[in-house]
């Protein structure tokens, strides 16, 4: 999916008001300095691409993020503010239902959500001019 035509300001507002709170809850008890950010993004569409990938694609050691509250709110925000996004997700959602696993917060998941934190942080920054 190409995130270029999303309403970034609306997604930013959704992140600040709700998604961030769920990330805070998920990460509670974890030091912000515990994990280094290894995933970065260069502009808002790129940030959303990386956010979608980390939130909804199961990875080794962390298969369960898509069922977390922050993931469901992320999905809702993208569905509302990115034209045509929901249609592209129907097949992915059906595949995910078949793979559904018990929710377990592993260290790998905490690390992955820490990466998400960094991506959202970068998404939030207004445009910075390169020197």
């Amino acid at each position: 999916y190409d995130f270029t035509n999303c309403d970034f300001e609306k997604i930013k507002a959704a992140y600040l008001s709700t998604i961030s709170k769920d990330l805070i809850t998920y990460m509670s008890g974890t030091k912000s300095t515990e994990f280094n950010n290894t995933v970065s993004c260069s502009n808002r569409p790129h940030c959303l691409t990386e956010i979608q990938s980390l939130t909804f694609n199961p990875t080794a050691g962390c298969a369960s993020l898509a069922k977390e509250m922050f993931a469901m709110k992320t999905k809702a925000a993208l569905a509302i503010w990115c034209p045509g996004y929901s249609e592209t997700q129907i097949n992915a959602t059906q595949a995910m239902k078949k793979r559904r696993k018990r929710k377990v917060t592993t260290n790998k998941c905490l690390e992955q959500v820490s990466q998400l934190q960094g991506l959202w942080r970068r998404f939030n920054r207004p445009l910075l001019k390169q020197q």
Partner: antibody, heavy 119, light 107 residues
Framework: QVQLQQSGAELVRPGASVKLSCKAS????????MHWVKQTLVHGLEWVGT????????AYTQKFQGKATLTADVSSSTAYVELRSLTSEDSAVYYC????????????WGQGTTLSVSS | DIVMTQSQKFMSTSEGDRVSITCKAS??????VAWYQQKPGQSPKTLIF???NRHTGVPDRFTGSGSGTDFTLTISNVQSEDLADYFC?????????FGGGTKLEIK
């Protein structure tokens, strides 16, 4: 733990330039933007600008465009603000402050550097 | 630029009281507001971020609320160590802008 250590007080002549530093420790320097804030009795707290240490990208308040230049040295985890063509109006305490973990706020502050511009 | 107005420059309260400090934005800043405490001779300290989240180590007598244009910092059971200046800051849009500050005095 996160610490921002700023350089010492400066007394400089009008018309000169000065470069203030802010050494970060306790976190990965390139993961967080760094902001600079000016404080005076007259104007209170004013946001000067921000820098993304990873890319070198910057943004400034219009008032400080041309007055302040923000840079970052990743190798030493140090952020800098250079102030040029100094006047008494630039006399203030300057703070560096780190972008918050979740974005949309700043969390940790340096101890501040007092700049006095006087002939 | 977005203007952040703290209409009360000074507020006087007694130990044990509850006090509310307000901040009004000139346009919608959603929940991108933080509150800072500054004691004499010290650098500012983060109290509340994203309108209502307490920063690490901040006592739970400090509470933030609001969204859009109206924000409130409430201190319940005021202590003598709460004597300080309190500032709001919007981080929705560059340039980020601070409120003028409210000085809390303890009777």
């Amino acid at each position: 733990q996160v610490q921002l250590q700023q350089s010492g007080a400066e007394l400089v002549r009008p018309g000169a330039s000065v470069k203030l530093s802010c050494k970060a420790s306790g976190y990965t320097f390139t993961d967080y933007a760094m902001h600079w804030v000016k404080q005076t009795l007259v104007h209170g707290l004013e946001w000067v600008g921000t820098i993304d240490p990873e890319t070198g990208g910057t943004a400034y308040t219009q008032k400080f465009q041309g007055k302040a230049t923000l840079t970052a040295d990743v190798s030493s985890s140090t952020a800098y603000v250079e102030l040029r063509s100094l006047t008494s109006e630039d006399s203030a305490v300057y703070y560096c402050t780190r972008e918050g973990s979740y974005g949309g706020y700043v969390d940790y502050w340096g101890q501040g550097t007092t700049l006095s511009v006087s002939s | 630029d977005i203007v952040m107005t703290q209409s009360q420059k000074f507020m006087s309260t007694s130990e044990g009281d509850r006090v509310s400090i307000t901040c009004k934005a000139s346009q919608n800043v959603h929940t991108a507001v933080a509150w800072y405490q500054q004691k004499p001779g010290q650098s500012p300290k983060t109290l509340i971020f994203l309108a209502s989240n307490r920063h690490t180590g901040v006592p739970d007598r400090f509470t933030g609320s609001g969204s859009g244009t109206d924000f409130t910092l409430t201190i319940s059971n005021v202590q003598s160590e709460d004597l300080a200046d309190y500032f709001c800051l919007q981080l929705w849009n560059y340039p980020y802008t601070f409120g003028g500050g409210t000085k809390l005095e303890i009777k």
